[in-house]
């Protein structure tokens, strides 16, 4: 008998090279093989459970950056007046959540913020839990 | 043939809003669906393997906080003279281990320490390994 | 019918108590049960996917330490002029990658660097993906 294989784990790595003041960061998924999807600049959550979240990047100017998952809820990450980020976190997310950025700069100009090495990784930690597609 | 499902991963999120000087933090599990259990203010480890551990909280006064898993062993986390914590770690735990807090404050009063956003998450990283219930 | 079991997850914990200037750290795996292997002072990657990486240690002198996975690629971790490390990261690694250290000290003497609590943990986060042995 063939031993059971793991169904693919829900995970995604998105990159971002540009963020817009008072808005968010433009995210793209470099791989077509990702098990999670990007839609309207947000990562769509289909499966309930804990997620390991890694966020990295170097910014062209000082900014405040938050990573949200649900309207009316506090952010997953919140960084104030930083020029770089290299953070890891764990959060419980659920079907219908959407992970997206909010960015504000402290300059009066409304220029785009350039990002070097901008990367956001989400990895589901509770396979076997509830999913809806 | 139906593809195999993952058995549930051992994981838990506990909250704590109060710690007692020279003792620990009073932990409660907000969900009845957790795959791990709390007993005598400790999280019970049933499965051997690596665990992802996330610890967060804001404290009402400066304290030293350690997270232990076994008598006679060093702590998983140890924070000295802090008013907040936001840490992630990886540790190897085994059946019969118990994860619990120890807290000491530097004030002469023996008042309880209030905690805002106190959260401890454990997620097993080696499903398929030894478990005993 | 017996519920399916998880095949073992690719993971390893290696220890290091000594590093050599201009070279790397001498790594040993304390357990024979590891699902990943050490060869020529490197951890061999057999499975594609995200890896959770934990790196800890206290060093006997100030050093710069990098953790590499592929020739011609940037490091997984890079720490400059540190006496200790306690870092967690997530990285995408693939079959044929090898995880190894590079260390340089800033002293003129070529002393061995003693390490206390030197530990590197890798845990595969995408079981079910491509592996080659």
């Amino acid at each position: 008998q063939v031993p059971p294989q793991y169904p693919p784990i829900q995970s995604i790595r998105v990159q971002f090279t540009r963020c817009e003041n008072e808005k968010g960061c433009i995210i793209t998924s470099p791989s077509k093989d990702e098990t999670m999807k990007v839609q309207d600049n947000s990562i769509i959550i289909n499966c309930d459970g804990f997620y390991l979240i890694s966020l990295k990047g170097y910014f062209s100017e000082e900014l405040s950056l938050s990573l949200y998952y649900r309207k009316g809820r506090g952010p997953l990450f919140s960084l104030s007046k930083v020029t770089s980020v290299d953070s890891i976190g764990v959060a419980y997310l659920a079907f219908k959540d959407k992970v997206y950025f909010n960015v504000t700069t402290h300059s009066t100009s409304y220029k785009d913020i350039q990002v070097n090495g901008g990367e956001l990784i989400l990895i589901h930690q509770n396979p076997g839990g509830f999913c809806a597609y | 043939q139906v593809p195999p499902q993952y058995p549930p991963i051992q994981s838990i999120r506990v909250q704590f809003t109060r710690c007692e000087n020279e003792k620990g933090c009073i932990i409660t599990s907000p969900s009845k669906d957790e795959t791990m259990k709390v007993q005598d203010n400790s999280i019970i480890i049933n499965c051997d393997g690596f665990y992802l551990i996330s610890l967060k909280g804001y404290f009402s006064e400066e304290l030293s906080l350690s997270l232990y898993y076994r008598k006679g062993r060093g702590p998983l986390f140890s924070l000295s003279k802090v008013t907040s914590v936001d840490s992630i770690g990886v540790a190897y735990l085994a059946f019969k281990d118990k994860v619990y807090f120890n807290v000491t404050t530097h004030s002469t009063s023996y008042k309880d320490i209030q905690v805002n956003g106190g959260e401890l998450i454990l997620i097993h990283q080696n499903p398929g390994g030894f478990c005993a219930y | 019918q017996v519920p399916p079991q998880y095949p073992p997850i690719q993971s390893i914990r290696v220890q290091f108590t000594r590093c050599e200037n201009e070279k790397g750290c001498i790594i040993t795996s304390p357990s024979k049960d590891e699902t990943m292997k050490v060869q020529d002072n490197s951890i061999i990657i057999n499975c594609d996917g995200f890896y959770l990486i934990s790196l800890k240690g206290y060093f006997s002198e100030e050093l710069s330490l990098s953790l590499y996975y592929r020739k011609g690629r940037g490091p997984l971790f890079s720490l400059s002029k540190v006496t200790s490390v306690d870092s967690i990261g997530v990285a995408y690694l693939a079959f044929k990658d090898k995880v190894y250290f590079n260390v340089t000290t800033h002293s003129t003497s070529y002393k061995d660097i003693q390490v206390n609590g030197g530990e590197l943990i890798l845990i595969h986060q995408n079981p079910g993906g491509f592996c080659a042995y």
């Epitope: - | 062993r73 060093g74 702590p75 000295s80 | 206290y58 002393k111 061995d112």
Partner: antibody
Framework: EVQLVESGGDLVKPGGSLRLSCVAS????????MSWVRQAPGKGLQWVAY????????TYTDAVKGRFTISRDNAKNTLFLQMNSLRADDTAVYYC?????????????WGQGTLVTVSS | SYELTQPPSVNVTLGETAHITCGGD??????VQWIQQNPGQAPVVIIY???NRPTGIPERFSGANSGNTATLTISGALAEDEADYYC??????????FGEGTQLTVL
């Protein structure tokens, strides 16, 4: 002025237990790795146990592994050595010592010692 | 495990120079400390990191370390220097290894 003051030494029967303490002052205790070193009567110095500044990593000499436990309370500037299953050859003066900064395993500041006698 | 070899005793004439050696495999690749202990007293570090003197230690004490031998030199030995001297290194992480000790006698 750096001071390390040990206490808890006593006469104890074989198989018994003792807990040694070492209170530190005159330096920032929580930033220093610490050791216990012992000296049997008429003999040389022998390293016993080591603990990193945050208490997370500990190391022991083979002769005491599984019997002794080193720990620390950074809030109280105190180092401990819990000694169980004591044997006659554990009889010694026990010194607590703080590492020289950046030289791991190099006891630098020493206490005056506390005498542990294991005898029936 | 790592071993350090010291002579059990060294004699020196008052005012002359004493050399105490400490042998170990490639000891030059490790930092050496020298510790002085007077009878019934706590140990005191007199040399750290091969050749550095802590504050308050007289200049007559000096250290060197290369190859397989580290040396403690006492230039112009005084009667008060009569004591036991231990060399020490850190090995395999943080295992502090001590030599057997050398008894210095000032004649």
């Amino acid at each position: 002025e750096v001071q390390l003051v040990e206490s808890g030494g006593d006469l104890v029967k074989p198989g018994g237990s003792l807990r040694l303490s070492c209170v530190a002052s005159g330096f920032t205790f929580r930033t220093y790795h610490m050791s216990w070193v012992r000296q049997a009567p008429g003999k040389g110095l022998q390293w016993v146990a080591y603990i990193t500044r945050d208490g997370i990593s500990t190391t022991y000499t083979d002769a005491v592994k599984g019997r002794f436990t080193i720990s620390r309370d950074n809030a109280k500037n105190t180092l401990f050595l819990q000694m169980n299953s004591l044997r006659a050859d554990d009889t010694a003066v026990y010194y607590c010592a703080s590492d020289l900064v950046l030289v791991l395993g190099a006891p630098f500041y020493w206490g005056q010692g506390t005498l542990v006698t294991v005898s029936s | 495990s790592y071993e350090l070899t010291q002579p059990p005793s060294v004699n020196v004439t008052l005012g002359e120079t004493a050399h105490i050696t400490c042998g170990g495999d490639s000891i030059g690749r490790k930092y050496v400390q020298w510790i002085q202990q007077n009878p019934g007293q706590a140990p005191v570090v007199i040399i750290y990191k091969d050749s550095n003197r802590p504050t308050g230690i007289p200049e007559r004490f000096s250290g060197a370390n290369s190859g397989n031998t580290a040396t403690l030199t006492i230039s112009g030995a005084l009667a008060e220097d009569e004591a036991d001297y231990y060399c020490q290194v850190g090995d395999s992480g943080t295992k502090a290894v001590f030599g057997e000790g050398t008894q210095l006698t000032v004649l």
